[in-house]
Structures are given as C-alpha cells and as structure tokens.
C-alpha cells in the first residue's frame, strides 16, 4: 500500500498577476521516491521516509520536503583562537641534554619558570591564554614555543585577535630587549638575547558565517544571506521576517524558489492583489448575474 500525503490547495495570485492554485508539493522539482518496507513516500530533495514521515535535509521542510526554510541554523564557535609560533633565546639558563626530555625535572622546572615569565610579560592582554613550549635547543637555550590567544566570537573577532598578536610582538620584543645579562648575571626572572626573538608563524581560527550559510543553503546559496542580531549571525532568506533584508509581501505569502524569493499574492472575497510585493489591490466588481 502507498502512504498518502494530503496536498492542500491555496488560491493565490503570482506577482505576474494570474491566479494559480499551488499544491504544497512543488511539481517543478523532480520527485525521488524513498521506500522503507512496504511504505513509500514522495520525499523530495534528498529527504527520506522514516516509516512515519519525510525526514528532510537542510534547507528543506514540509510533508514532502518540498518547501525551503526561511532561516538556517548556523552555529559559530563560542570562542575563537590564535596560535603564535615564537622563538626566544634564554641566556640565564645554560642548555643541558636533560632539557630535551619533557618528563625530566630540568624541563619541568624550566617550563615552570618560563611560563611564569611569559604570564608576567603578557599579563595585560585579555586574549592571552598561556604558552606551550614545543622544543628547547642549544644556544644558550633556544625556546620554540606557542603563545595561545582566545576571545569570544564576535563579527570582529579577526580584528581582535590580530590586535592581540601585535601586542604580543611588542611585549616580547620589549622584555627580550630589557631583560639582558649584565656581567654574566641575570637580575630578572629570566634574561634573553635580544636578537634571538622571532615570530615564526601565526594561525587564526577561520570561521566565516557567510560561507557556512552558503554551504547549507545549497542551490539557494545566492538567495540566503547573513544578518547579525546581538552580535550573533543569522542565515536567512528574504522570506524570514524581522531583518533588514526581509521581503515585505504585504497581501501575499513569500516563497523561495530557485530563482529567489517571490511573493504569491492572495485573492480575497473583495480584492485581487498583484505586483511584485502584492501591494496593488484591485477591488472586485459586485455585478449580480440573474438567471
């Protein structure tokens, strides 16, 4: 037996002016049939029948997955981060082979002192999370390490992280210039070789809500756009109300098609509505026909 899906019919007038009956199943889209056991359903656009109903893929919904949603959930990360690969040369500690072993007492003590020193250096940077030593080598001690930065996601996160990386560069340059050995002795927590300070690489979290929105919208990518509300991105079509890009269909219903958003104008007992935004009303004539 076939699973039947009720199809409701609405009397609407397209923006071109002609009255049309629109079934909720869009006959212009090829139908794929999904069969589970002896049930089958006309689940379209990649949707599948779960035994009870069509399970639709984004951006579709409806009994047959024939309609396009007005908004798509996009979830930016709570926080975004940057990782700076730096090298500094510590002159107040002499290199020994034990420093290469990350489980040695020597490495653990060096790591503790170095971390304390860097926490002091970067204490004024709100995005600063910590440092991670990746390698120690001879000369006195060349310290290859990562500086980790993190901030809450906002539309301007890249600027915030870029600014933080610049401050890191300024601060490490300053400390490695000021904290130097005098008479083969260090009066600071750590002393450095000024010329040994290098920024090797900077990696910033890449998150683009526009890209995520376009990917999820699939063939409707050109018609979905990102708008922000309270610093949060929303992936919307013009049919979603309450946004700057929202389409006002006045006396009609906004519907997405593969050509974009269009208004399907209503016909009431007294008026026909037409126009691109269904804002042109024509009063029906009240002639009575006598038989």
């Amino acid at each position: 037996p076939l699973a039947t899906i009720p199809v409701s019919t609405t009397s609407l007038t397209s923006s071109e002016g002609s009255t049309i009956s629109t079934p909720s199943v869009d006959i212009s889209t090829p139908v794929t049939t999904s069969i589970v056991g002896d049930q089958c359903s006309r689940c379209k656009n990649g949707g599948f029948w779960d035994g009870l109903k069509c399970q639709c893929l984004t951006p579709y919904y409806g009994e047959s997955c024939e309609e396009v949603v007005n908004s798509i959930d996009i979830a930016p990360p709570e926080t975004v981060s940057a990782q700076m690969e730096l090298t500094v040369t510590v002159t107040s500690v002499k290199f020994t082979d034990e420093l290469k072993n990350h489980s040695s007492q020597e490495f653990r003590e060096f790591n503790k002192t170095f971390t304390e020193q860097m926490n002091i250096v970067y204490s004024g940077i709100p995005e600063y999370v910590g440092v991670n030593i990746t390698n120690l080598r001879l000369g006195s001690v060349v310290v290859e390490h990562d500086v980790l930065l993190r901030t809450k996601y906002t539309p301007e996160y890249k600027t915030a992280l870029d600014n933080a990386t610049e401050v890191v560069k300024q601060k490490i340059t300053k400390v490695t210039t000021e904290q130097i050995m005098t008479n083969d002795n260090c009066s600071a927590l750590m002393c450095f070789n000024t010329t040994g300070t290098q920024v090797q690489n900077i990696t910033v979290t890449q998150y683009d809500p526009v890209e995520e929105c376009r990917q999820k919208a699939e063939e409707y990518e050109d018609y979905f756009l990102v708008e922000y509300r309270d610093q949060k991105p929303y992936c919307i079509s013009p049919c979603e109300s309450g946004f700057n890009a929202s389409k006002n269909c006045n006396h009609g219903k906004c519907q997405m098609s593969q050509n974009g958003a269009r208004c399907l104008c209503v016909t009431t007992e007294t008026h026909w509505y037409s126009g691109e935004d269904c804002n042109q009303g024509t009063q029906k004539s009240h002639h009575h026909h006598h038989h």
């Epitope: 500690v93 002499k94 003590e109 083969d184 260090c186 927590l189």
Partner: nanobody, 123 residues
Framework: DVQLVESGGGLVQPGGSLRLSCAAS????????MSWFRQAPGKEREGVAI???????GYADSVKGRFTISQDNAKNSLYLQMNSLRAEDTAMYYC?????????????????WGQGTQVTVSS
C-alpha cells in the same frame, strides 16, 4: 621531596668570619645550580652567590672579594665562606637549589629553598 637545611649562622663581630653550610637531601642538584640568598628585616630577598655544575660562580657586587661559594658533591653540601663581615651583612641567609644551570640571582628563578640561618654582625 627535596630538602635543604642550612647551618653555621650566628653572632659575629664586624670584620669577623663565618662559614655557612647547606645540606641537600640527595645529589639531585649536582648537575644543576645552588645558591645563597639573604633577606634583611623589611627588605626584599637578594641574591648573594651562585655556583653551577659547569663550575661557573657568580656573586652580588656587594660581596665580591669577601664571600666565596663552594660545593662538595660527595657530601651533597653547599658552603658560603664569609670574610670581612659588615653590619649590613646582617640577615637571614637561605640556601636555594635548581635543576637548571642558572645564571640568575633573582629569587623567583629558584624553586627549592631551605628554612634559613640567621647571621648577625654586631659589636
């Protein structure tokens, strides 16, 4: 757990001498560094002398030529020979140790400490 115990402090007249000792619980620091620090009442702790496993020694300017740091690895001991003592040398003297070959007389660079021994220079 590493333990450091100082001894040898006491009351001495100006111009006199004292020898401080520091016993480490094992020879862990024979490949690192050991040092002496002091702290006078109401003042910050300051570095006095360092000795490292590579034979390097360093002294604070105020004690150069008067104090000598030495080590006996066989006995896991550190010493500070103090000559020509002055009233301004009066302080609590602390032994500190590090697994690292350090060149730093900043107390924050040192992670292992003894309880201290009092040195008073007075007539």
């Amino acid at each position: 757990d590493v333990q450091l115990v100082e001894s040898g402090g006491g009351l001495v007249q100006p111009g006199g001498s004292l020898r401080l000792s520091c016993a480490a619980s094992d020879n862990t620091f024979s490949r690192g560094s050991m040092s002496w620090f002091r702290q006078a009442p109401g003042k910050e702790r300051e570095g006095v002398a360092i000795i490292s496993s590579d034979g390097w020694t360093g002294y604070a300017d105020s004690v150069k030529g008067r104090f000598t740091i030495s080590q006996d690895n066989a006995k896991n001991s550190l010493y500070l020979q103090m000559n020509s003592l002055r009233a301004e040398d009066t302080a609590m003297y602390y032994c500190a140790a590090s697994f690292l070959v350090l060149r730093a007389l900043n107390p924050k660079a040192w992670h292992y400490w003894g309880q201290g021994t009092q040195v008073t220079v007075s007539s």
